[in-house]
């Protein structure tokens, strides 16, 4: 894991978009793919395991001295916690990748609480770039303005 971070807690949740679509993980040809689609109200939603980390911000970066801290997460499908959501900076996609030991920097996302209900996930390795929804897929998108709904997600405890 990233140097200087420490695990705070972990908890399962379902992940849905601003438009109430569900994020799910489907096994296809032995590999998990990420789907974003409408799920029926009665349908059981897939869950992710969120691991929350505390990360200090260097004084030079934050202007806060030692008091600046960020909350970061990495995420795994609950049905296979050895794979992580991963930011692919080559093609700006979001993938699931299996890790041998600990998640790489590309699997960490700075958590932004945008409102009491919605959060956004900023790529640790690509500041200003967030997990977003594009054409019913998760992708990496740049935040154009603060009210960008396609980067807003709801975490629901089951």
């Amino acid at each position: 894991s990233i140097q200087g971070t420490s695990l705070l807690t972990q908890s399962p949740a379902s992940l849905s978009t601003y438009n109430d679509q569900s994020v799910s993980f489907v096994l296809e040809n032995g590999c998990y793919v990420i789907n974003v689609d409408d799920s029926g109200k009665d349908q059981e939603q897939d869950q992710v395991l969120l691991r929350y980390y505390e990360s200090p911000c260097p004084a030079s970066q934050s202007g806060d001295g030692v008091d600046g801290k960020k909350l970061m997460v990495n995420m795994s499908p609950i049905k296979d916690t050895d794979i992580w959501l991963h930011a692919n900076d080559k093609d700006y996609s979001v993938e699931l990748q299996r890790g041998d030991v600990s998640p790489p920097e590309q699997a960490f996302f700075v958590l932004h609480k945008k409102s009491s209900d919605f959060v956004s996930f900023e790529c640790k390795n690509l500041p200003g770039t967030y997990i977003g929804v594009k054409d019913n897929q998760l992708a990496l998108v740049e935040e154009k303005d603060e009210s960008c709904n396609n980067i807003m997600f709801k975490l629901s405890k089951i």
Epitope: L8, T9, S11, Y52, E54, C57, S62, G63, D64, G65, D67, G68, K69, K70, L71, V110, L111, H112, K113, K114, S115, S116, E146, S147, K157
Partner: antibody, heavy 122, light 107 residues
Framework: EVQLVESGGGLVQPGTSLKLSCLAS????????MTWIRQAPGKGLEWIAS????????YYPDSVKGRFTISRDDAKSTLYLQMNSLRSEDTATYYC???????????????WGQGTLVTVSS | DIQMTQSPASLSASLGETVSIECLAS??????LAWYQQKSGKSPQLLIY???RLQDGVPSRFSGSGSGTRFSLKISGMQPEDEADYFC?????????FGSGTKLEIK
């Protein structure tokens, strides 16, 4: 060093208005959710209002909703609480607080101002 | 709303004694629970966050534990400067709510 300094408290009559200010220094103000918490004399702590780090969202308990308004001026690193239609039960010390993490509300409130006393009485 | 029921309301302890304060939540939530100490005439001070994480600068005799609906604060070896009011607070769901407080005095 992180500092939060409240001002604007005082003695006012029921039904009137008051605006509290909180000047923040020692940190990057626009990265943090900010919150007002109050404490009536000899009583416990009560959450009053929170504002997102972008200023785009504000939250209140039912006890003050519609009467109090939280706002922020990032250029001045200042948090405000506009209090209208004040009642005797609003008598309390009002504290300005800062969240623990950038962009988040998780982790409690590590920084508090010294508080400003608001007394509502005729 | 999540109600936080704190007990006991008051407590007397001898110097060196270990004391515990409990907070019960009306519904379960993640570990976004904080504990504060407030000395007479002063602003509250964060002791513990994330249920068990010690805030920087807080003596290690303070510790927090619990999850779900039951949380506790322990002081291992009461010191004179620990005489204060203590409050728990949940940050998991709006409205944010506090326990009613525990007054800790030296016996």
């Amino acid at each position: 060093e992180v500092q939060l300094v409240e001002s604007g408290g005082g003695l006012v009559q029921p039904g009137t208005s008051l605006k509290l200010s909180c000047l923040a220094s020692g940190f990057t103000f626009n990265n943090y959710w900010m919150t007002w918490i109050r404490q009536a004399p000899g009583k416990g702590l009560e959450w009053i209002a929170s504002i997102t780090y972008t200023g785009g969202g504000t939250y209140y308990p039912d006890s003050v909703k519609g009467r109090f308004t939280i706002s922020r001026d990032d250029a001045k690193s200042t948090l405000y609480l506009q209090m209208n239609s004040l009642r005797s039960e609003d008598t309390a010390t009002y504290y300005c607080t800062r969240a623990n993490y950038y962009y988040n509300t998780y982790g409690g409130f590590p920084y508090w101002g010294q508080g400003t006393l608001v007394t509502v009485s005729s | 709303d999540i109600q936080m029921t704190q007990s006991p309301a008051s407590l007397s302890a001898s110097l060196g004694e270990t004391v515990s304060i409990e907070c019960l939540a009306s519904e379960g939530f993640s570990n976004d629970l904080a504990w504060y100490q407030q000395k007479s005439g002063k602003s509250p001070q964060l002791l513990i966050y994330a249920a068990s994480r010690l805030q920087d600068g807080v003596p290690s005799r303070f510790s927090g534990s619990g999850s779900g609906t039951r949380f506790s604060l322990k002081i291992s070896g009461m010191q004179p400067e620990d005489e204060a009011d203590y409050f728990c607070q949940q940050g998991s769901k709006y409205p944010l709510t506090f326990g009613s407080g525990t007054k800790l005095e030296i016996k």
